[in-house]
């Protein structure tokens, strides 16, 4: 599940990884667009083992994965879910 949040909180990610995570181990992906207190876009990956990692938005593999998820969502809504948190 791909989620996009708009939040007034500061940056959530202290450290980012570009290491590939196979989709079979990913539970959901949370995207935090830049702005509202954080100058950069953030991507948070929730894994099947309940751990969480911030992924570098420039990592090729996450860009490919998000593109696949976006394409799929346009033809098979409601997945991914787009949630908006209004401050």
């Amino acid at each position: 599940v791909l989620e996009v949040y708009y939040t007034s909180l500061r940056c959530r990610c202290v450290q980012e990884s570009s290491v590939f995570i196979p989709r079979r181990f990913i539970d959901r992906i949370q995207i935090l667009p830049r702005g509202n207190g954080c100058p950069r876009k953030e991507i948070i990956v929730w894994k099947k083992n309940k751990s969480i990692v911030c992924v570098d938005p420039q990592a090729e593999w996450i860009q490919r994965m998000m593109e696949v998820l976006r394409k799929r969502s346009s033809s098979t809504l409601p997945v991914p879910v787009f949630k908006r948190k209004i401050p």
Partner: antibody, heavy 121, light 106 residues
Amino acid sequence: EVKLVESEGGLVQPGSSMKLSCTASGFTFSDYYMAWVRQVPEKGLEWVANINYDGSDTYYLDSLKSRFIISRDNAKNILYLQMSSLKSEDTATYYCVRDVAYDDSYAMDYWGQGTSVTVSS
Amino acid sequence: DIQMTQSPSSLSASLGGKVTITCKASQDINKYIAWYQHKPGKGPRLLIHYTSTLQPGIPSRFSGSGSGRDYSFSISNLEPEDIATYYCLQYDSLYTFGGGTKLEIK
């Protein structure tokens, strides 16, 4: 040539522990996720656990996660499975398996010959 | 958890003939399915990944197709060495194997 060789299994008592190892060769071990899969006698295959490139991330079959620990030593090209509080239902052939590298479309490809573990009193 | 229902559990066919095995997932697995051949005393051998991509060295007699929840695997021009148990594996979300299909030659 990709080779995965499991250590000898054997007969163990219920409640005891056992550590399996798997020596890998013929590929860059640290470039791959690795896994353990088991086959209960006369039954099908069951995924047990997975580990990422450097051992910092592990995944388990829900019913096993409190008793089994997967680990790896990239310097020695060895994969491990520490099994504790063993039960009769853990009796199976355990396979060491090479998993995905950097492409989601790929599945577990190379398997060891398997090692037999029997839990019985 | 995703369940994989594989059928039939066993089948018998003639040399030179064709067999088809099916696997149905409990939800859409987005083509992330692999097929394995398993012979006694050996580790399973990957034949096909991502629904229809043949592994290097696997003859084109083996093929796979499907999408969504429904997938199939076929062997044509059956040969004696094809006697084995065949398994499907979904790897869209963790891993689940089908129950297996034991193939015998008439």
